[in-house]
Amino acid sequence: DAEFRHDSGYEVHHQKLVFFAEDVGSNKGAIIGLMVGGVV
């Protein structure tokens, strides 16, 4: 199973490194339903 790695900022997903934007500093809407920034 894919596992999110909150410490490293990366996760192994289908044999490649994917940036884990669920990281604390993410501003891309990682949290379901959390308003991010303004209306764009």
Epitope: D1, V18, K28, I32, V39
Partner: antibody, heavy 112, light 111 residues
Framework: QVQLVQSGAEVKKPGASVKVSCKGS????????VHWLRQAPGKGLEWIGR????????IYTPKFQDRVTLTEDTSTDTAYMELSSLRSEDTAVYYC?????WGQGTLVTVSS | DIVMTQSPLSLPVTPGEPASISCRSS???????????LYWYLQKPGQSPQLLIY???NLASGVPDRFSSSGSGTDFTLKISRVEAEDVGVYYC????????FGQGTKVEIK
């Protein structure tokens, strides 16, 4: 008014595929992740996966890995969720979510 | 998968009175970065869900301060200090320490 507008209800046969759309209205969908969830009748919420429209990067729940495809068309501010090899257990309301906005839900009914 | 278990599954409430919902995770949601990856959502009748609380104790925008959440790594409680009629619906806890999984939901209704 800022909203996510999903496509209408679908009725599909077992084994078929369905493609649900999610269009940003007054909202630039390419900036934030688009999450997809579903809710079977009388059941709880289940996360399917998410797509980063900026680069097309996707993450799926392992349960759906082999049957679901999340895509986006940034030129039309629309995200898509396609689910293949449908079975009766896939009957559910499917939701897209981006930033603080939720789509109204799309009911997909799988019945022979 | 991390399993989220809620109790009770049904909660009759009286307006003006407090109410609480419990949620337990099969694995600690407290990460070594100090963040607890626990969330609460409310789905009002006939509506899409909405986020109430994120990362265990943070109130989402527009959520009344009568809602609060606390807990340890595996045991969590959502509290409503004084229930209002508009609070009825199904409450879900969720985690995203590893992907996203949700509890089975707690239906809150007026007595």
């Amino acid at each position: 008014q800022v909203q996510l507008v999903q496509s209408g209800a679908e009725v599909k046969k077992p084994g078929a595929s369905v493609k649900v759309s999610c269009k940003g209205s007054g909202f630039n969908i390419k900036v934030y992740y688009v999450h997809w969830l579903r809710q079977a009748p009388g059941k709880g919420l289940e996360w399917i996966g998410r797509i980063d429209p900026e680069n097309g990067e996707t993450i799926y729940t392992p349960k759906f890995q082999d049957r679901v495809t999340l895509t986006e068309d940034t030129s039309t501010d629309t995200a898509y969720m396609e689910l293949s090899s449908l079975r009766s257990e896939d009957t559910a309301v499917y939701y897209c979510v981006s930033s603080g906005y939720w789509g109204q839900g799309t009911l997909v009914t799988v019945s022979s | 998968d991390i399993v989220m278990t809620q109790s009770p599954l049904s909660l009759p409430v009286t307006p003006g009175e407090p109410a609480s919902i419990s949620c337990r995770s099969s694995k600690s949601l407290l990460h070594r970065n100090g963040i607890t990856y626990l969330y609460w959502y409310l789905q009002k009748p006939g509506q899409s869900p909405q986020l109430l609380i994120y990362q265990m104790s943070n109130l989402a925008s527009g959520v009344p301060d009568r809602f609060s959440s606390s807990g340890s790594g595996t045991d969590f409680t959502l509290k409503i200090s004084r229930v209002e009629a508009e609070d009825v619906g199904v409450y879900y806890c969720a985690q995203n320490l590893e992907l996203w999984t949700f509890g089975q939901g707690t239906k809150v209704e007026i007595k």
